[in-house]
């Protein structure tokens, strides 16, 4: 914003109140400039002279009109698991958010304070509800017919190929082996997605099949950060 | 591009109260006043009051204090004016206006919300 | 609070015609806070001129504006038809901002 223009304090009329981007001044008994976003106040306004404005020093801010005699300085720099995605400058304070694959698990006026890595599903889970920017990964067993043989913060459970002739019966970590004669499916084949805004899609690998350990009923695990809950791994 | 939305067309009864807002697009919503006036039919413009979203200050006129409410949610740019115990003579376009920032000119303006008060 | 009065408070003017409206304040005014908006049927008022004398975006350079202290006024150097609209000035000298009345200009 451009700085304001020059003009004299002046006394409001009785049952009038200052100009907008000017204050009171209960000293001076008068209505003074504000100094604009990028300033503060150097030199307070006196009856016959107005408000001072300075530029704020590297490092500090003003992001409102203001009559503040220092600038705010800015926050700390991003740690590694953050990205800056607002720079310090003398109108803004920095902005850190969490990087892809990671959320944020403790948030500030403005950016994140804390980000932690979000869940992956192991094999025999599937995501139930995606991880967001301020939530983490939640994760569900594969119902019956159902799979998913990766660990991954953004597969879901995949239904098991349909076989004329089974080889192998599925589980809920791996997918049905057939015999030799073409197999239909109950859905296009491949992996299946959810959208993931904050999270890189994870590499598909065929790990040995293992049986699943999750139990029969399907359930939701607890959001938030936590230990790793059955179902999930860590980093 | 600078863009003030206004919210519908309103018709009220008298003594009922309603909320108009107006969602700024397109510059920092903190950093300008924002801006309420009242055009009756054939008639001429007459300020209600401002809100700087950045800190909440508002400033009202006498005559529409204790009948307008300024509000504003940094979260969704938007500024609301809230208006209560309307009567006939409430019975106007609305606009909210943006503050240029420098000579006090009102440099946008939304489309403007009608309100219609009517037994 | 400070009081704007407009005059004429509806004119007519033909095509080419040079055209002045003036706008007249109770108490001094600074040419920086003295305003000019443009409001045709159905639509919402435009900053025109600002500070007295300067254009806002867009607007034709027939129009000027000029004045001080307690008398201004705003100035068409050749009348076209889409002109025609109500012309309001506006003070921010002193709280409150008022507005003049307005001026309705038509084409004869």
């Known amino acids: 914003l451009p700085a304001q223009v020059a003009f004299t304090p002046y006394a409001p009329e009785p049952g009038s109140t200052c100009r907008l981007r000017e204050y009171y001044d209960q000293t001076a008994q008068m209505c003074c400039s504000k100094c604009s976003p990028g300033q503060h106040a150097k030199v307070f306004c006196t009856k016959t002279s107005d408000t001072v404005c300075d530029s704020c020093e590297d490092s500090t801010y003003t992001q409102l009109w203001n009559w503040v005699p220092e600038c705010l300085s800015c926050g700390s720099r991003c740690s590694s698991d953050q990205v800056e995605t607002q720079a310090c400058t003398r109108e803004q304070n920095r902005i850190c958010t969490c990087r892809p694959g990671w959320y944020c698990a403790l948030s500030k006026q403005e950016g994140c304070r804390l980000c932690a890595p979000l869940r992956k599903c192991r094999p025999g889970f599937g995501v139930a509800r995606p991880g967001t920017e301020t939530s983490d990964v939640v994760c569900k067993p594969c119902a019956p017919g159902t799979f998913s043989n990766t660990t991954s913060s953004t597969d879901i459970c995949r239904p098991h190929q349909i076989c004329n002739v089974v080889a192998i019966p599925g589980n809920a970590s791996m997918d049905a082996v057939c015999t030799s004669t073409s197999p239909t499916r109950s859905m296009a084949p491949g992996a299946v997605h959810l959208p993931q805004p904050v999270s890189t899609r994870s590499q598909h690998t065929q790990p040995t099949p293992e049986p699943s350990t999750a139990p029969s009923t399907s359930f939701l695990l607890p959001m938030g950060p936590s230990p790793p809950a059955e179902g999930s791994t860590g980093d | 591009e600078v863009q003030l939305q206004q919210s519908g067309a309103e018709l009220a009864r008298p003594g009922a109260s309603v909320m108009l807002s107006c969602k700024a697009s397109?510059?920092?919503?903190?950093?300008?006043?924002m801006q309420w006036l009242k055009q009756r039919p054939g008639q001429g413009l007459e300020w209600i009051g401002a809100?700087?979203?950045?800190?909440?200050?508002?400033r009202y006129t006498q005559k529409f204090k204790g009948k307008a409410t300024l509000t504003a949610d940094k979260s969704s740019s938007t500024a609301y004016m809230q208006l209560s115990s309307l009567a006939s003579e409430d019975s106007a376009v609305y606009y909210c206006?943006?503050?240029?920032?420098?000579?006090?000119?009102?440099?946008?303006w939304g489309q403007g919300t009608s309100v219609t008060v009517s037994s | 609070q400070i009081v704007l009065t407009q005059s004429p408070t509806i004119m007519s003017a033909s095509l080419g015609e040079r055209v002045t409206m003036t706008c007249t304040a109770s108490?001094?005014?600074?040419?920086?806070?003295l305003h000019w908006y443009q409001q045709k049927p159905g639509s919402s008022p435009k900053l025109w001129i600002y500070?007295?004398?300067n254009l806002a975006s867009g607007v034709p350079a027939r129009f000027s504006g000029s004045g001080s202290g307690t008398s201004y006024s705003l100035t068409i150097s050749s009348m076209e038809a889409e002109d025609a609209a109500t012309y309001y000035c506006?003070?921010?000298?002193?709280?409150?901002?008022?507005f003049g009345g307005g001026t309705k200009l038509e084409i004869k």
């Open positions: 206006v943006r503050d240029d920032g420098l000579y006090y000119a009102m440099d946008y």
């Open positions: 397109g510059y920092t919503f903190t950093s300008y006043w």
């Open positions: 809100i700087y979203p950045g800190d909440g200050d508002t």
């Open positions: 108490s001094s005014v600074s040419s920086s806070y």
């Open positions: 500070s007295t004398s």
């Open positions: 506006h003070q921010y000298h002193r709280s409150p901002p008022t």
